[in-house]
């Protein structure tokens, strides 16, 4: 008799998930000498251990601690770029500005970027059919808890001036329900972080509005100021310029030194 399987509202685990995670880990540790000591098989085992055989609506940050320990990484704390609803452009930016880092430029972020995964209670199977949706099913699912955990740790590590890239084309430029708004903002450490500088990226090429006056940016400023962190906002008008050096990263003028 076929075993009854919970049908969730979200897409199932990304196909070839174990192979993808392992391959990404190997690639990352080859490219980043400071992470060469990492044993990728152990990383996969820890990743798997966080969600396999567990109810996918009952995952905790504690479940991911073995993985967090193995993936411990030091990035320059004053070179952190956070982002919200504008991932691709943020990643294009750090591909050029190699001394700045998004979460997805770290090992753990790189492993999980754009992937979905979940298991089933009391079986060692990975569920490739469906996984819980954050809104429709439950928030304590494997993917959401993973990103909440790594995002919190990433924000806690930040120091000096922290940058965040925001999408000026969205109705809510700052969304307090986003990972940035609900996790990262509240885990910046006032004793280490002097300023949060928001880059509001304009979409339209003829756009000359001052989006730093947007009510949601004022809301962000209020939250940050109450946490005793200075706030700065800059309008950024030509996002196509981010591609200037993507095609020609060897151009010496594309480095952080001008």
């Amino acid at each position: 008799v076929p075993r009854w399987r919970q049908q969730w509202s979200g897409p199932g685990t990304t196909k070839r998930f174990p192979e993808t995670v392992l391959a990404r880990c190997v690639k990352y540790t080859e490219i980043h000498p400071e992470m060469r000591h990492v044993d990728c098989q152990s990383v996969w085992d820890a990743f798997k251990g966080a969600f396999i055989s567990k109810h996918p609506c009952n995952i905790t940050e504690e479940d991911y601690q073995p993985l967090m320990k193995l993936g411990t990484q030091t990035v320059p704390c004053n070179k952190i770029l956070l982002w919200s609803r504008i991932k691709d452009l943020a990643h294009q930016f750090t591909q050029v500005q190699r001394d700045m880092f998004t979460l997805e430029d770290t090992l753990l972020g790189y492993l999980a970027d754009d992937l979905t995964w979940c298991g089933e209670f009391n079986t060692s199977k990975i569920n490739y059919q469906s996984c819980p949706d954050w809104r429709k099913d439950c928030s304590n699912n494997p993917v959401s808890v993973f990103w909440k955990t790594v995002s919190r740790r990433f924000a806690e590590a930040a120091c000096d001036v922290v940058h965040v890239m925001l999408n000026g084309s969205r109705s809510k430029i700052f969304d307090k329900n986003s990972t940035f708004g609900s996790v990262e903002v509240h885990n910046l450490q006032p004793e280490k972080v002097q300023t949060l500088e928001a880059w509001v990226i304009h979409g339209g090429r003829e756009d000359s509005r001052d989006l730093c006056q947007d009510p949601t940016i004022k809301e962000l400023e209020s939250i940050i100021s109450k946490r005793n962190i200075q706030f700065s906002c800059k309008n950024i008008y030509r996002p196509d310029k981010f591609l200037q050096c993507v095609k020609n990263p060897e151009d010496s003028s594309c480095t952080s030194e001008i």
Epitope: V96, D207, S208, R209, D210, C233, N235, C245, S253, I258
Partner: antibody
């Protein structure tokens, strides 16, 4: 090292035309916005026009809109400014300037300039 | 369009600190750039992104931007710093503007 060399300036009568060129070297020309900035004798700097990396997007100051046309030839590493219906107030040194990368919109490098004199 | 206002002239004794202001509505929301221009020469970028110094520019040049005012500060001013200084910003579309310029005189 980055070099920008302007040419094509000279004396022209009001209502006349002139085409300025800027030869670029020392960087990947096709990766940068390029600009023209001018300076009338004894006056301050005035931005004139900008063009995107691929030449698709063009921007003009109100004072020259409809009269000046910016263009570029990435295969020749050259920037152009076609100036029509010239007026006495267009008399200035015209500089070619390369944009800063990424989030910055300022001028990292400038040519030495070419003088345009509009007079009868 | 934003308008940038600079004092026409600033005087400073050698070794002292010179401060040149540049004001405009909500200027803090835009990156500001500063250029030095000596007679008969092309402008040279001395500060970009409010406070960053291009390589080759002496450490005595610094910049800040808050409220409606950006400031170029030259600490321990030298005779060779005598020049015209221009601030500049970009507010989108075709709105790239320069301040009127400030003549710095080293007494």
């Amino acid at each position: 090292q980055v070099q920008l060399v302007e040419s094509g300036g000279g004396l022209v009568q009001p209502g006349g035309s002139l085409r300025l060129s800027c030869a670029a070297s020392g960087f990947t020309f096709s990766s940068y916005y390029m600009n023209w900035v001018r300076q009338a004798p004894g006056k301050g700097l005035e931005w004139v026009s900008a063009i995107s990396m691929d030449g698709v997007y063009k921007y003009y100051a109100d004072s020259v809109k409809g009269r000046f046309t910016i263009s570029r030839d990435n295969s020749k590493n050259t920037l152009y400014l076609q100036m029509n219906s010239l007026r006495a107030e267009d008399t200035a040194v015209y500089y070619c300037a390369r944009d800063l990368p990424l989030v910055y919109t300022g001028f990292a490098y400038w040519g030495q300039g070419t003088l345009v004199t509009v007079s009868s | 369009d934003i308008e940038l206002t600079q004092p026409p002239s600033v005087s400073v004794a050698p070794g002292q600190t010179a401060r040149i202001s540049c004001s405009g509505d909500n200027l803090r929301h835009y990156y500001v750039y500063w250029y030095q221009q000596k007679p008969g020469q092309a402008p040279v970028l001395v500060i970009y992104g409010d406070s960053k110094r291009p390589s080759g520019i002496p450490e005595r040049f610094s910049g800040s931007n808050s409220g409606n005012t950006a400031t170029l500060t030259i600490s321990g001013t030298q005779a060779e710093d005598e020049a015209d200084y221009y601030c500049q910003t970009y507010t989108g579309g075709a709105s790239l503007v320069f301040g009127g310029g400030t003549k710095l005189t080293v007494l």
